[in-house]
């Protein structure tokens, strides 16, 4: 008795976080025996789409010419071989940016900070939002994700960092979102350059949760130590 068909691999190019109006291609890679590929979108009638395999039959392309709110969400794919349907792929979360106006990102007391001192990055939105994300350029994952406790909407979120080391230096952006769909984010804030000066080099801050990624240690989430989130917001890791 043969075991279940191996699950396919699902990914998006150029990535899974796409600006509104930009194109994205979803790929599903199975085996050379695949006869058909199926893509399912959570909370949409299944199958969401079907495609014949591209030669040499081990993958299929699902094209999205222009990203819109409707495409944002969680996807899984399957392939059909002569012996039946495969297991589902691991989910792909397709996130759209540009759903809301961009927040403002600032550093308190200043974006120029001495190593060993404290700094707070402040993300402010014009309209009340309940989720805020802080992103560091070239990081593989959001650094921090602050979500309001009881659906209470906030105009801002604070991301305290203490003590600051050279690892914290770099370019940051933040996004805001509504809880009803964490697949829809605002336009990114303008970039903020955090400059760490001085030689008070303490130990590297270590993440409170390990993240499986092929990237180097600089790309791991940085958990500010001894910090308290903005009132009404709780820290939440994606």
């Amino acid at each position: 008795q043969a075991g279940p068909l191996p699950k396919p691999t699902l990914w998006a190019e150029p990535g899974s976080v796409i600006s509104w109006g930009n194109s994205v291609t979803i790929w599903c890679q199975g085996t050379l025996e695949a006869r058909e590929y199926r893509l399912d979108k959570e909370e949409s009638p299944a199958p969401w789409d079907r495609q014949n395999p591209l030669e040499p039959k081990n993958k299929a392309r699902f094209s999205i010419p222009s990203m819109t709110e409707d495409y944002a969400g969680r996807y899984r794919c399957y392939y059909r071989s002569p012996v039946g349907w495969s297991q589902p792929s691991d989910p792909l979360e397709l996130v759209m940016t540009g759903a809301y106006s961009k927040p403002t990102l600032s550093a308190l007391p200043s974006p120029l900070v001495t190593s060993g001192k404290s700094v707070t990055l402040l993300c402010q939105s014009r309209s009340p939002m309940d989720t805020f994300l802080l992103i560091k350029e070239r990081a593989a994952h959001p650094l921090l994700h602050l979500r309001s406790e009881h659906g209470a909407q906030q105009h801002q979120a604070e991301f305290p960092m203490s003590p600051v080391t050279s690892v914290h230096g770099g370019t940051y952006r933040c996004f805001s979102s509504h809880g009803f769909s964490h697949y829809l984010l605002s336009h990114p804030s303008d970039p903020l350059e955090l400059i760490v000066s001085g030689s008070l080099e303490g130990p590297r801050p270590s993440p409170t949760r390990s993240v499986s990624t092929a990237a180097g240690p600089e790309d791991q989430p940085l958990m500010p130590t001894g910090s308290v989130p903005h009132s009404g917001l709780r820290r939440h890791w994606e």
Epitope: W20, G21, N22, S23, T25, W48, D49, S63, P65, S66, T68, E69, D70, Y71, G98
Partner: antibody
Framework: QLQLQESGPGLVNPSKTLSLTCNVS????????WSWIRQPPGKGLEWIGY???????NYHPSLQSRVTISVDTSKNLFSLKLTSVTAADTAVYYC?????????????????WGHGTTVTVSS | DIQMTQSPSSLSASVGDRVTITCRAS??????LAWYQQKPGKVPKLLIY???TLQSGVPSRFSGTGSGTDFTLTISSLQPEDVATYYC?????????FGQGTKVEIK
């Protein structure tokens, strides 16, 4: 069957604002990109911009500073405003539709077009 | 911005001839390409989308191929009613640029 109909003044004075409306009849505006295209006399097609039913827009970079496209889904229409017009803006202006989502059929090219309205910029 | 370049700008062929029009994108656009036919004094009409998918109601003598940067529109057997200007257009990320057009005439 979906039909598009452009309307607006055929003559606009230089430096003034060109305003056109596209009336959408026989179908829904949801999940489509609603586009404006123009064609100067004897020349090719030029894409101006589009609006999605959510209100998000994209414009041709060369016109970005002068163009605004808006939508009123309750009245089934979308509009074009082009400020500070010159003789170079004289053209036939078309409105057109492109499918925006798998559920809406053709999500490729501009599959439904209005008949076009001629706009002349002159004093 | 990505530029779309069509060639030739015009051509003259006999009824029954095979006619080929090419469109080149300055950067890759996957298969996000449409072809339109515009007869003199008329509204443009969608012929092909997704580079090779024939729009409903379009005669099968029209076909499209290509992906990435190079695309082709072929009329397998030119008919008198095919006299028109043909445009390619990219429709992925904005701007949705058109090619400059190819005018097709009968010899």
């Amino acid at each position: 069957q979906l039909q598009l109909q452009e309307s607006g003044p055929g003559l606009v004075n230089p430096s003034k604002t060109l305003s056109l409306t596209c009336n959408v009849s026989g179908g829904s505006m949801s999940n489509y990109f609603w586009s404006w295209i123009r064609q100067p006399p004897g020349k090719g097609l030029e894409w101006i911009g589009y609006i999605y039913n959510s209100g998000n827009t994209n414009y041709h970079p060369s016109l970005q500073s002068r163009v605004t496209i808006s939508v009123d889904t309750s009245k089934n229409l979308f509009s074009l405003k082009l400020t500070s017009v010159t003789a170079a803006d004289t053209a036939v202006y078309y409105c057109a539709r492109r499918g925006g989502y798998y559920g809406s059929g053709n999500y490729g090219g501009l599959d439904v077009w209005g008949h076009g309205t001629t706009v002349t910029v002159s004093s | 911005d990505i530029q779309m370049t069509q060639s030739p700008s015009s051509l003259s062929a006999s009824v029954g001839d095979r006619v080929t029009i090419t469109c080149r994108a300055s950067q890759g656009i996957s298969n996000y390409l449409a072809w339109y036919q515009q007869k003199p004094g008329k509204v443009p009409k969608l012929l092909i989308y997704a580079a090779s998918t024939l729009q409903s109601g379009v005669p099968s003598r029209f076909s499209g191929t290509g992906s990435g940067t190079d695309f082709t529109l072929t009329i397998s057997s030119l008919q008198p009613e095919d006299v028109a200007t043909y445009y390619c257009q990219k429709y992925d990320s904005a701007p949705w640029t058109f090619g400059q057009g190819t005018k097709v005439e009968i010899k």
